[in-house]
């Protein structure tokens, strides 16, 4: 039988090495066996080049490009092939739909004041261009109780978080992770960094009366 | 050392057709661009094709669109160009010159980096 | 297509001056930030052409520090401090951005 695409190939880029595209067959597919993404820079004396997809779920394709270090101007071609047959084609430009790294190694310390300090590394070079566009949000809540949950916007340059433990409960365990995202480019979210895990032990005022 | 030594240039009359070849050593050859330029006797230089690494991606001038081709054989680290239908303003030396580096998705720049002596064509009845 | 207009077409300068060539292009030359494909190149009497600059401003292996490239966009000067007497010969700008590529008509360099 025939092999069509259901969902069109959505493309999303970290703005530094890698691209990635997913799109959704009609119905279940080897991806790696039976499709081929190619890709080629709208660029004088590009080549073309070939990724090989792998399977997210049964008739779901993922493709995982390395580019070089992007810049605004970039336009790829993408063609879908199964075989010979073309089955998509469009162009993706970077820069347009950017989605960023995850932050990485969140940590919780405790902090003077009854405050907790939350600290993250920005996952971009300072050479790239996102480096000095991220901001963040922070999600806290506690293990258990999914109604005690906090929501916090970080839009300053550095990747901390201050946090009064009075405003947690105490004794209770929390979790926190962080995304980040870049506002002049008009990204989407990052996926949301590991959780890391801390106890509250802040003891309310009024237990000192 | 990097080199480039075209042949092929000859005497050839109006309609007729050529071959140029360009050998290639001193550097890797197929990660390559490659391109022509030809000067008319007394004149400037003027850009006639150019071939990515693969051979895959061609480009050509419109003066020369659909009557010159642009080739190359990795394996003999060898460039060509087939120029067909010839015409007197095609008269001119030329030459082959290495371009951009096309092995990285963006290829790398550095201009035209290294040319060839050049071979001389000249079309006349 | 891009067109390349060079100023002036010739140009004497006595030994150990400096020459200023012009090099204009119909678009922008500007793909991302530091990187315009414009390049000088050297064609000494009865040579091949010689590379000087690539992107605008980058020497070309062996090209001594006399020559330089500036500008962005749309204007780009090659200068050459303390002429020499070997530097003589015709001086071409190329883009190299887009197809077609092209050349400027020439500056001739005559020392005095």
């Known amino acids: 039988g025939s092999v069509k695409v259901l969902h069109e190939p959505s493309c999303f880029s970290d703005y530094i090495s890698t691209s990635v595209c997913q799109w959704k067959m009609d119905h279940p597919t080897n991806c790696s066996a039976e499709l081929r993404l190619s890709y080629q820079l709208d660029f004088m004396g590009s080549e073309n080049h070939t990724c090989v997809p792998e399977n997210r779920e049964d008739s779901v394709c993922v493709c995982s490009m390395p580019i070089d270090d992007a810049v605004e101007a970039d336009v790829y071609q993408l063609d879908l092939w199964a075989g010979q047959q073309l089955l998509w084609s469009g162009s993706f430009q970077p820069s347009k739909h950017v989605k960023p790294r995850t932050p990485g190694n969140l940590t919780v310390h405790p902090n003077i004041s009854h405050t907790w300090l939350l600290m993250w590394t920005n996952p971009y070079p300072t050479e790239n261009h996102l480096h000095s566009e991220l901001t963040y949000m922070v999600n806290v809540s506690n293990d258990n109780d999914p109604e005690d949950f906090k929501v916090y916007n970080v839009t300053y340059m550095g990747p901390t978080l201050r946090l009064a433990a009075s405003t947690l409960k105490s004794g209770a365990s929390y979790s926190a992770r962080v995304r980040a995202w870049a506002q002049t480019y008009n990204s989407t979210w990052s996926d949301w960094s590991p959780s890391t895990t801390w106890l509250n032990y802040y003891e309310p005022w009024e237990q000192h009366l | 050392e990097v080199q480039l030594v075209e042949s092929g240039g000859d005497l050839v009359k109006p309609g007729g057709s050529l071959r140029l070849s360009c050998v290639a050593s001193g550097f890797t050859f197929r990660d390559y661009a490659m391109t022509w330029v030809r000067q008319a006797p007394g004149k400037g230089l003027q850009w006639v094709s150019l071939?990515?690494?693969?051979?895959?991606?061609?480009y050509y001038a419109d003066a020369v669109k659909g009557r010159f081709t642009i080739s190359r054989d990795n394996a003999k680290n060898t460039l060509y160009l087939q120029m067909n239908s010839l015409r007197a303003e095609d008269t001119a030396v030329y030459y082959c010159a290495v371009d951009r580096k096309t092995k990285t998705i963006r290829p790398q720049y550095y201009g035209l980096w290294v040319w060839g002596q050049g071979t001389l064509v000249t079309v006349s009845s | 297509d891009i067109v390349m207009t060079q100023t002036p077409l010739s140009l004497s300068v006595s030994p150990g001056e400096t020459a200023s060539i012009s090099c204009r292009s119909s678009q922008s030359l500007t793909y991302s930030i530091g990187y315009n494909y414009l390049d000088w190149y050297l064609q000494k009497p009865g040579q091949s052409p010689q590379g000087l600059i690539y992107?605008?401003?980058k020497r070309a292996s062996g090209v001594p520090d006399r020559f330089s490239g500036s500008g962005s966009g749309t204007d780009f000067t090659l200068r050459i401090s303390r002429v020499e007497a070997n530097d003589t010969g015709v001086y071409y700008c190329m883009q190299g951005l887009q197809s077609p590529l092209s050349f400027g008509q020439g500056t001739k360099l005559e020392i005095k």
């Open positions: 992107l605008g401003h």
């Open positions: 071939i990515n690494g693969s051979g895959g991606k061609t």
